[in-house]
Interface confidence: low
């Protein structure tokens, strides 16, 4: 395993005394059953803590909650429950924090047995709250417009869509029988509605509506809709095809004015589509296999979201609405990790370094042995535990972790063998975006990244014993020091640090329990005195990302360019600081066939980089429907991969002739595209988009 506190490790001097002076305990004198934390704004130090206690008595639930506020990153808290008149705030979607640094907070109260509800709203980072009665009961968390935090959207438990234009002061009902609603760009609202009054039974009979003026006027942009989703600049709808229960994906890049059918297999009622990741360049789409297989195929799109290349087969994605291990490694461009369900029924991890172009097993860590499951003790891989392992009850306290400003660092639970093991997992760290791995910690841990990777902090998961130790590393997980933050162990529930990994503070949350008393407790540790000085130029070194063969002129080229980063030396113990910006130097690469995907009617045979014509289409003119027009395609089979910046070298030419003949999909557009003023229809029913918490862009 990685070196511990021995001669190989440069120990941080006097760290115990330094940390002891910067350890802040806060006791919460309440008996609440759950705690939720919310950070208000960026670099403000403001944290809201909601503790809730619920007791079911006969047919109703009696609840009590308390609200606490910190403005020093969790070192001290003040009870501000009186600011909200001691009202019970819902723990499931009670705290809604405004976008960016708006300082806006909406708390949704639980007003049992009422036809309406109540919110408390703040515009000053939760210093003051204004009480506001609602004419409806929210079904889910109130949604802020990403562009204007004064604009709020809410779906009621009667499936009415409500909007507020003045940060919740006044609410207007937009529409009835709304099944799903989302903010788009430029304060546009998209929603599906069903005039039959039900959201659960007639999912393939929904209409997709858009309003660009907060409900003054509406436009029907699709019918026979099963579901819709937004990812990057793409609007997706799954639409009933008219062939029995089959449905297909349609895509729009102009907010639903025109649609094109995606070149993806249609699915039946037992299958599903899911957008795993999306940006303005492209989309990763999972298409479920027929039958109850638990796996499907990942496809990657072209820049229009229309042409798709097969990326990974047997991609593990359990029951509809289930788990997938798909993870975007945000610390290095183009890297994703997921799991496949192998032919032998085992679950295995795969990694791509080129945005889904090729997938491989993860390299075995140098300091690890293959476990007993390995058929060949010399040949095995690292397998990463993610959402699937957690769902199946394995002791995996955290998902894989990476941060854009901690370049190259990936932390994850894993096992080394032929496949994911049900044995107790260990913590592995990569410092090069997943190319190589090291076993960092024995057994399951909670972990977090501070100071843009300058410090990694971990607490061992120990369900049966109290916790009083924290481990930290200043060299990207090579060496670890242990600090006892309290004499009396606590029942540990989690680590909390400010999102964005720029903070130097970590909060350890837990509770103490005796025969007569239980209370929540937090310890906030500030590492500022461990990293005493600001980092200087001498503390950084040049690192070429994606480097696998330094002798090769094209070494590091991914998606047509390579990037050199300034990275903190492992031996430097200094502060990157809050204002740290990742310094990178891109350089363009020459184009090769690897920089192109295959166009309509072409495919790549296995282990070949050339695109060849699909036999069944050979010699045919390729006509397809694109943006509501019929296009005639003249092509030699290649189209540049989205986001690829290569220049020169191999450059297959592509030509599209426009026939300008209308060919709008009659499945998507109603008889005539419908515009009307604000109206309403009766009915109720609900459909939750359950995947946003998992960072899945859209799941039908």
């Amino acid at each position: 395993s990685a070196p511990g506190e021995d001669e190989e490790c440069g120990r941080v001097r006097d760290f115990v005394a330094k940390l002891a002076n910067n350890t802040h305990q806060h006791i919460f004198n309440d008996l609440s059953g759950s705690v939720s934390l919310s950070w208000v704004g960026d670099s403000t130090g403001v944290i809201l803590v909601l503790t809730t206690f619920q007791v079911p008595i006969f047919m109703i639930t009696i609840g009590q909650s308390k609200l606490y506020r910190s403005e020093d990153y969790g070192k001290n808290f003040k009870d501000i429950t009186d600011l909200i008149n001691n009202t019970f705030i819902r723990s499931d979607f009670g705290i809604a924090i405004g976008p960016e640094n708006s300082g806006k907070v909406v708390l949704t109260a639980d007003v049992s047995g009422s036809h309406g509800s109540r919110i408390f709203r703040s515009s000053d980072f939760a210093k003051n709250f204004v009480q506001q009665e609602l004419p409806f009961v929210p079904l889910m968390q109130i949604m802020y417009s990403p562009q204007n935090s004064d604009y709020l959207l809410a779906l009621s438990n009667k499936n009415e869509l409500w909007v507020s234009k003045n940060f919740g002061g006044k609410w207007e009902k937009l529409y009835d029988t709304v099944c799903l609603a989302k903010w788009g760009s430029d304060n546009t609202i998209f929603f599906t509605a069903n005039h039959n009054g039900s959201c659960s039974n007639d999912r393939g009979m929904l209409e997709l509506w858009r309003t660009s003026d907060l409900g003054k006027s509406f436009k029907t942009i699709g019918s026979k809709i099963y579901s819709f989703g937004l990812g990057g600049r793409f609007l997706f709808a799954s639409v009933m095809t008219g062939k029995g229960t089959l449905r297909a994906i349609h895509v729009s890049t102009d907010q639903g004015d025109t649609w094109s059918m995606a070149q993806l297999p249609p699915v039946g009622h037992e299958q599903f589509y899911s957008i795993l990741a999306a940006n303005d360049d492209m989309v990763f789409m999972h298409v479920d296999e027929p039958g109850d297989s638990g796996f499907g195929t990942i496809f990657t799109s072209d820049d229009r979201g229309i042409v798709y290349s097969k990326s990974l087969e047997r991609h593990l994605y359990t029951t509809t609405g289930g788990e997938t291990d798909f993870t975007n490694v945000t610390s290095l461009r183009g890297v994703y990790i997921t799991s496949i369900l192998a032919e032998d029924k085992s679950v295995q991890s795969m990694i791509t370094f080129d945005q889904g172009g090729r997938w491989t097993h993860l390299r075995k860590p140098e300091n690890s042995k293959c476990d007993a499951t390995a058929r060949d003790p010399e040949k095995c891989s690292l397998h990463i535990h993610a959402a699937y392992s957690i769902a199946t009850g394995l002791n995996v306290p955290m998902l894989p972790l990476s941060e854009p400003n901690a370049v190259g660092i990936v932390i994850a639970h894993g096992s080394v063998g032929d496949a994911i093991s049900v044995m107790r997992p260990d913590v592995y760290i990569s410092d090069d975006g997943g190319y190589s791995w090291t076993k960092a910690l024995e057994g399951p841990h909670h972990y977090t990244i501070l100071d843009s990777g300058g410090i990694i902090v971990a607490v061992e998961q120990n369900a049966h014993q109290g916790v009083n130790q924290i481990k930290f590393s200043t060299d990207e997980g090579q060496c670890w020091q242990t600090y006892n933050f309290t004499k009396d162990p606590i029942f540990f529930t989690g680590l909390a640090s400010e999102p964005g990994a720029r903070s130097m503070n970590i909060s350890i949350w837990g509770y103490r329990s005796s025969l007569f008393h239980q209370y929540w407790i937090s310890y906030t540790i500030d590492f500022k005195d461990i990293l005493e000085r600001n980092c200087e130029e001498k503390d950084y070194t040049i690192w070429l990302a994606h480097s696998t063969d330094p002798e090769d002129y094209e070494d590091g080229c991914i998606l047509g360019y390579k990037e050199q980063f300034l990275r903190l030396r492992k031996s430097s113990v200094c502060q990157n600081g809050r204002d740290y910006v990742v310094t990178k130097q891109p350089s363009i690469c020459l184009c090769s066939l690897e920089d192109f995907l295959c166009d309509f009617g072409y495919y790549r045979p296995e282990n070949d980089s050339k695109c060849v014509e699909q036999p069944e289409l050979k010699g045919h003119d390729l006509e397809f429907c694109l943006y509501g027009r019929e296009e005639h395609l003249t092509t030699n089979g290649y189209r540049k991969i989205p986001g690829d910046k290569c220049q020169g070298g191999v450059n297959p030419v592509r030509e599209v002739k426009d026939l300008k003949k209308k060919c709008t999909s009659n499945f998507l557009s109603p008889e005539k595209q419908n515009s009307k003023s604000n109206g309403s229809a009766g009915g109720s029913g609900g459909l939750n988009d359950i995947f946003e918490a998992q960072k899945i862009e859209w799941h039908e």
Epitope: D292, S293, G294, T319, D344, K345, T392, G393
Partner: antibody
Amino acid sequence: EVQLVQSGAEVKKPGESLKISCKGSGYIFTSFWIGWVRQMPGKGLEWMGIIYPGDSDTRYSPSFQGQVTISADKSISTAYLQWSSLKASDTAMYYCARHSRGSFWYGAFQHWGQGTLVTVSS
Amino acid sequence: EIVLTQSPDFQSVTPKEKVTITCRASQSIGSSLHWYQQKPDQSPKLLIKYASQSFSGVPSRFSGSGSGTDFTLTINSLEAEDAAAYYCHQSSSLPHTFGPGTKVDIK
């Protein structure tokens, strides 16, 4: 339509051997785990074990390991539960059931056979 | 092995009443918990899979919730035909196990 059809009721004496069957139809038999569940008279359900007919991979509950053998013949889409020496305490209704998830055993028993009543009495 | 406990053992309920059955696991099983209904002299039938997903064809009055160690099956407005035994089943780790069952009858 997925169907699991079990063999008929059996009356046996202690010490005798027995093999009961469960024939699957309406789906790809080799791609789904099949489990066996015991229900003693007036009692609850007990999970005995499962088999993946594609490669005859079997997993037993410790309570039933060594007491019974689970097997399958994929050529005739049939799973079996057998005893080499029955005891009076083996008297029960035995159900076969198919998992909802193809390929791996995390999942619910989505389809059930009608049950086979085994009575062991001297 | 993971032990599932159900409560109550027995419940006698009048039609249209709400019924709540709980199932507790001895350790966390994520959402890998399923509910079955068994009527006298019949095979069990799947009601809810993965804690909260309704199986097709099951009346909407049946719903499930929970994750980790605590799970609930709710029958919103009991009908006479719902008199049966109800079992929970975990498929999180081998060996799979069933709860002891809850018998619901109609007053």
